[in-house]
Interface confidence: low
């Protein structure tokens, strides 16, 4: 999906509004510094694609995430203010729910959250000019 | 210990071009933007642009889109800003700084590299 | 274009307190940045997002910012903190945007 037509102001009132306070209640308990940010995006529908391959594509030691509270809130988020978005998402979900699994809060999940929040951070803070 | 180190001083004419490194050392290279930022004798500090490491983009500030070019070589954790059609004022001390991913400040120079433009 | 302005210089007496101030529209809703530089050498980070101080940067440096202005106050000054001044900030579509610098001279 090519996020360039998202309207990013009303994702980022999203994120301030709700998200990241779901960002930061899944890491309670967890130091600020116990991870290092290794994922990057230079500017926002980069970030956006980032963002979403690290919310809902299942990775190696962390399954879970697509249905966590932040994840919904972003997911309904894209679907609303990105024209076409719901669409591309249809058969990913349905797979989804096929693999439901036991939530599990694992370290690798926490890392991936961490990582998550730098991305929305660089989200609302832009080095590169919006094209 | 973390360090951005920069090549020597050069001495360039008027229509020429110059390529500076910045070899970074003691962290993860890919892990951070490096920036530029120049000062010319005696004036104030100017932000040139950025280059991320992790995928080679870049963003250059206005006033030198079209004559500034900046890359990186991550297997010697090197970055490169090269700097084209020079003029006088040009001559200037060219910094690299790492930013800081996570709040976007400037938390590590380079110790600069003069670059004379004369004919 | 983003414009930050700076005082060209501040004087001070050891142990009083230095502001420096930097303004800029609406200021406030950005983060801003300050950087000492001394003669010869390569600028330092003192501090971040308005009002953070990096490790290693005495508790004297502080830093403020709303409206249309940020200020870096040193309490205590030194005079080893004689050095020049920037503020620094993003902007959308100007990218990186220093001020012009302040000169603190310790009397």
């Known amino acids: 999906y090519d996020f360039t037509n998202c309207d990013f102001e009303k994702i980022k009132a999203a994120y301030l509004s709700t998200i990241s306070k779901d960002l930061i209640t899944y890491m309670s308990g967890t130091k600020s510094t116990e991870f290092n940010n290794t994922v990057s995006c230079s500017n926002r529908p980069h970030c956006l694609t980032e963002i979403q391959s690290l919310t809902f594509n299942p990775t190696a030691g962390c399954a879970s995430l697509a249905k966590e509270m932040f994840a919904m809130k972003t997911k309904a988020a894209l679907a609303i203010w990105c024209p076409g978005y719901s669409e591309t998402q249809i058969n990913a979900t349905q797979a989804m729910k096929k693999r439901r699994k036991r939530k599990v809060t694992t370290n690798k999940c926490l890392e991936q959250v961490s990582q998550l929040q730098g991305l929305w951070r660089r989200f609302n803070r832009p080095l590169l000019k919006q094209q | 210990q973390v360090q951005l180190v920069q090549s020597g001083a050069e001495v360039k004419k008027p229509g020429a071009s110059v390529k500076v490194s910045c070899k970074a050392s003691g962290y993860t290279f890919t892990g951070y933007y490096m920036h530029w930022v120049r000062q010319a004798p005696g004036q104030g500090l100017e932000w040139m642009g950025w280059?991320?490491?992790?995928?080679?983009?870049?963003n250059y500030g206005q006033k030198f889109q079209g004559r500034v070019t900046m890359t990186r070589d991550t297997s010697i954790s090197t970055a490169y800003m090269e700097l084209s059609r020079l003029r006088s004022d040009d001559t200037a001390v060219y910094y690299c700084?790492?930013?800081?991913?996570?709040?976007?400040?400037?938390?590590?120079w380079g110790q600069g590299t003069m670059v004379t433009v004369s004919s | 274009s983003y414009e930050l302005t700076q005082s060209p210089s501040v004087s001070v007496s050891p142990g009083q307190t230095a502001s420096i101030t930097c303004s800029g529209d609406k200021l406030g809703d950005k983060f801003a940045f300050w950087y000492q530089q001394k003669p010869g050498q390569s600028p330092v980070l003192v501090i971040y997002q308005d009002s953070k101080r990096p490790s290693g940067i005495p508790e004297r440096f502080s830093g403020s910012n709303s409206g249309n202005t940020a200020t870096l106050t040193i309490s205590g000054t030194q005079a080893m903190d004689e050095a020049d001044y920037y503020c620094?900030?993003?902007?959308?579509?100007?990218?990186?945007?220093f001020g012009g610098g302040t000169k603190l001279t310790v009397l």
């Open positions: 700084a790492r930013g800081n991913w996570n709040d976007d400040a400037f938390d590590i």
């Open positions: 280059i991320n490491p992790n995928n080679g983009g870049t």
């Open positions: 620094q900030a993003w902007d959308s579509s100007a990218g990186g945007v």
